[in-house]
């Protein structure tokens, strides 16, 4: 069972008085509609609260969007609705917050009557002031900021025009018509697909992929017969229709679309899809849907060029296009991902990888947990994690799994212990080692959040009844103390804390209901007095990540290196602080076969670390297409895993020869590429 709130857990003395002095209530008199909350900037304390509406709506004649601003992490709010001229802000556009600490905010308003265009409200001073700008178009999507320059904005119009602003939305220019999808790339590059004939839908598979590197002065067609495209890490992907049939294949470019290679992935038919699950500068996780409406597919992991793929996980749960997958990057430990598979018996099971998709295993059964009714053997079972799919199925799961890069090793998730995910009411489990071991943390479903880089975990029960209590832990979820934050319980809607888990403030949102009226209310609690002192050297202990067997010389080695971290001792009640930086020390490991993936034409039989030739390619010359040239590969079957830093040890031989022959895996050869200038 989960740890109780007994005397043994009385870790923080006199906490009630300390928290009571730091609990701030704010009642919002006239909030209606959907409430959205955004932090503006990092460590600024600025929060915007906006009520938005879906359009069309009957309510338009009665009300308006309300905008509130806090500059003290939610302790006090000021009504600044007059700054947006009492306009309606559309739910689907919400608040577009600028990258980094730019202080920029764009609100997209609904303008009634046959106006020429939409309207935006722009702020570049952390929402202190807004400038109203009428647009020469009606926006279809939220304004997109260039990651490199927050003055550059991109938007699609309802007429499928691609509009760009170079002065933070003051002036707009239509740089292209008939655009389906547009995305910022690196260095202020814009990628977009266009249709030639009827519409985006009608031309699917016959779209062109364009690029502009100068905000629309000049263009280059970098792909034809495009179905869709995506960006991940340093890779540009396009799914391209095959010449002869209705199947399509993934092509990949690492030079912004100048040259392309065909990815060694299965082609897919009309009803199937590809999905980039995760990508970084080293590699990509790609999901390839199975034929038919199976609800599952296969995960492949790429090499460093995004071309050669290794099968990583079969029967990966991913409902139809745009549907749900439980694929989760555990950001608190390098190389760890969690997802779900659909078993032959249609039950759903959780799998975890600690080595970036090299091997997947079930999650270890938590200590002190019983196997539930789904388990055939009452002593042998696993933990199964509820994520997006469970939430979409309206199971009693208020939150997806949570991890934070600066709260090393900590993963919090709802789960059940058995042979598969259970529809019973879940409990909350925690891992302090990145998913290797788990403990039941709280009984029943909860909202949870990490504060002060893991120094505090806060939780609130998910209940249909009003609540007035939150729980907090200063020892990574082992012991919990409860705090009554109000005498009058509220219908709880969510916990809100500043992204990045560095804050010590938590806001509890909800509403009170009395006869005929309901009022939104927030309680912001500052935990600074609970963690009275700053952490010192003695408050940290050394921890080796990915450790499974200390007797193994290479214990802790993942992707060619091991990392030791300084971690807060569970007994230390102190502040990591806003400026806390994770202290880690890497050390390089010797190479073993585990540090290599199987090269083109090779595969790994199950439970074997050796790569063997694919039977159908035995004795054939290994020739494949790379950047439009035929290459001859001399290999004994291994290629170093992307991002692997091992040195010495095993060193398989590998050589690639340019055959000086053209080949046509490229769906677009350089001579077909065209450029034009505006």
């Amino acid at each position: 069972s989960a740890p109780g709130e007994d005397e043994e857990c009385g870790r923080v003395r006199d906490f009630v008085a300390k928290l009571a002095n730091n609990t701030h209530q704010h009642v919002f008199d006239d909030l209606r509609g959907s409430v959205s909350l955004s932090w503006v900037g990092d460590s600024t304390g600025v929060i915007l609260v906006l009520t938005t509406f879906h359009v069309p709506l009957v309510i338009m004649t009665f009300g308006q969007s309300k905008l509130y601003r806090s500059e003290d992490y939610g302790k006090n709010f000021k009504d600044i609705t007059d700054l947006i001229n009492n306009t309606f802000i559309r739910t689907e556009f919400g608040m577009a917050i600028g990258p980094e600490n730019s202080g920029k905010v764009v609100l997209t308003a609904e303008v009634s009557g046959g106006s020429r265009g939409g309207r935006i409200f722009r702020s570049s001073d952390f929402a202190k002031n807004f400038v109203q700008t009428d647009l020469p178009f009606h926006p279809l999507t939220q304004m997109m900021y260039s990651p490199q320059n927050s003055d550059y904005l991109l938007a699609l119009s309802t007429e499928n025009g691609l509009w760009v602003s170079k002065n933070f939305g003051g002036k707009w220019e239509e740089i292209h018509k008939a655009v389906c999808l547009a995305k910022w790339g690196s260095d202020n590059t814009i990628f977009f697909t266009t249709y030639a004939n009827g519409s985006c839908k009608a031309d699917l598979g016959a779209l062109e992929l364009w690029r502009t590197s100068d905000l629309g002065k000049s263009f280059k067609t970098i792909g034809v017969k495009i179905y869709s495209f995506g960006l991940g890490g340093r890779f540009l992907f396009a799914s391209v229709m095959a010449d002869k049939d209705t199947t399509r294949r993934i092509h990949v470019s690492t030079d912004q679309g100048d040259t392309w290679s065909m990815a060694q992935l299965p082609s897919v038919g009309q009803e199937q899809f590809y999905s980039i699950l995760a990508a970084n500068d080293d590699m990509v996780f790609m999901h390839v849907d199975e034929p038919g409406d199976t609800g599952f597919g296969t995960i492949f992991t790429s090499d460093d060029r995004g071309i050669v793929y290794s099968k990583s996980l079969d029967r990966h749960l991913y409902t139809t296009t745009g549907g749900e997958t439980d694929f989760t990057n555990v950001t608190s430990l390098r190389g760890v991902y969690i997802t779900s598979v659909l078993s032959e018996d249609n039950s759903i099971q959780t799998m975890i990888t600690f080595d970036q998709g090299g091997r997947w295993t079930h999650l270890r059964k938590p200590e002190n947990s019983e196997c539930d009714a789904t388990a055939k053997n009452k002593n042998e079972c696993s933990l199964h994690i509820h994520a997006s799919y469970s939430i979409s199925q309206k199971l009693n799961v208020p939150m997806a799994p949570l991890s934070e890069p600066n709260a090393v090793g900590i993963v919090i998730a709802h789960g059940s212990v058995g042979d598969a995910i259970s529809v019973m009411v879940p409990d909350v489990y925690i891992s302090d080692d990145g998913g290797y071991s788990w403990t039941k943390m709280l009984e029943g479903p909860h909202y949870y959040t990490i504060l002060d880089s893991g120094g505090i975990i806060v939780a609130a029960e998910h209940s249909s009844r009003p609540i007035n209590v939150i729980k907090f832990s200063t020892d990574e979820g082992q012991c919990w103390q409860t705090y009554t934050f109000t005498r009058d319980p509220i219908y709880f809607t969510g916990l809100a804390s500043e992204p990045g888990a560095r804050s010590m403030n938590i806001s509890i949102w909800g509403f009170t209901e009395s006869f005929l009226t309901s009022q939104w209310v927030s309680y912001t609690i500052d935990f600074k007095d609970i963690l009275e002192r700053n952490c010192e050297e003695k408050d940290y202990t050394i921890w080796l990540a990915h450790s499974t067997d200390p007797e193994d010389y290479e214990d802790g080695c993942i992707l060619g290196y091991k990392e030791q971290f300084l971690r807060l001792r569970k007994s230390s009640v102190c502040q990591n602080g806003r400026d806390y930086v994770v202290t880690k020390q890497p050390s390089i490991c010797l190479c073993s076969l585990e540090d290599f993936l199987c090269d083109f034409g090779y595969y790994r039989p199950e439970n074997d670390s050796k790569c063997v030739e694919q039977p159908e390619l035995k004795g054939h010359d290994l020739e494949f297409c790379l950047y439009g040239r035929e290459e001859h590969l001399t290999t004994n079957g291994y290629r170093k895993i992307p991002g692997d830093k091992c040195q010495g040890g095993v060193n398989p031989v590998r050589e690639v020869k340019d055959l000086k022959k053209k080949c046509t895996s490229n769906f677009l050869s350089p001579e077909k590429q065209n450029s034009k200038s505006n």
Partner: antibody, heavy 124, light 106 residues
Framework: QVQLVQSGAEVKKPGSSVKVSCKAS????????ISWVRQAPGQGLEWMGG????????NYAQKFQGRVTITADESTSTAYMELSSLRSEDTAVYYC?????????????????WGQGTTVTVSS | DIQMTQSPSTLSASVGDRVTITCRAS??????LAWYQQKPGKAPKLLIY???SLESGVPSRFSGSGSGTEFTLTISSLQPDDFATYYC????????FGGGTKVEIK
């Protein structure tokens, strides 16, 4: 089977320093922390500090901070403890001990292998 | 640093007795507690780690319990070989030992 073998007994003058060695054999020295614990005649056990050979991360009990230096040499699987500014109260048996490990935490599981102890006598 | 208080400091018992030694931490240390046995002129020997886990090779008559601040070492039936001094040790702060409990023949 892992063994820790310590250097021989030492007699030192007050104000001088002593360096005790602890050589590991039969296990993966680098993956465990080595702690140093002392025991004065007729007294209890007192932790002085420890080191993790990988990376050489050392940490010390507050009482000994500035007076003790713990090092490790991975190539010879040997840990060292040097205590300076010796006084008569430092007369004790000094033990090195391997910290047991079940997870990534180096210091949480007790000391499962001990050296035979080195007697250090401080006398003028 | 976390202080460990062991009681009693001396305990007289006979072979076959059930013996209980208590250790209290000055603040919560979760389950990060170890118990050792030491005989005169010898190095300590680990009996229990993580409050209740028995070290391999240690007889099952030794058991540990507790979490937070209160811990107990129990010898269910005292054997002639068990007369020694016992120490608790916390491992969640900078390591500290209890003062020891000497178990002697009654």
């Amino acid at each position: 089977q892992v063994q820790l073998v310590q250097s021989g007994a030492e007699v030192k003058k007050p104000g001088s320093s002593v360096k005790v060695s602890c050589k590991a054999s039969g296990g993966t020295f680098r993956n465990y922390a080595i702690s140093w614990v002392r025991q004065a005649p007729g007294q209890g056990l007192e932790w002085m500090g420890g080191i993790i050979p990988i990376g050489g991360w050392a940490n010390y009990a507050q009482k000994f901070q500035g007076r003790v230096t713990i090092t490790a040499d991975e190539s010879t699987s040997t840990a060292y403890m040097e205590l300076s500014s010796l006084r008569s109260e430092d007369t004790a048996v000094y033990y090195c001990a391997r910290q047991g490990r079940k997870t990534g935490y180096y210091y949480y599981y007790g000391m499962d292998v001990w050296g035979q102890g080195t007697t250090v006598t401080v006398s003028s | 640093d976390i202080q460990m208080t062991q009681s009693p400091s001396t305990l007289s018992a006979s072979v076959g007795d059930r013996v209980t030694i208590t250790c209290r931490a000055s603040q919560s240390i979760s389950s990060w507690l170890a118990w050792y046995q030491q005989k005169p002129g010898k190095a300590p020997k680990l009996l229990i780690y993580k409050a209740s886990s028995l070290e391999s090779g240690v007889p099952s008559r030794f058991s540990g319990s507790g979490s937070g601040t209160e811990f107990t070492l129990t010898i269910s039936s005292l054997q002639p070989d068990d007369f020694a001094t016992y120490y608790c040790q916390q491992a969640d702060g900078h390591i500290t030992f209890g003062g020891g409990t000497k178990v002697e023949i009654k």
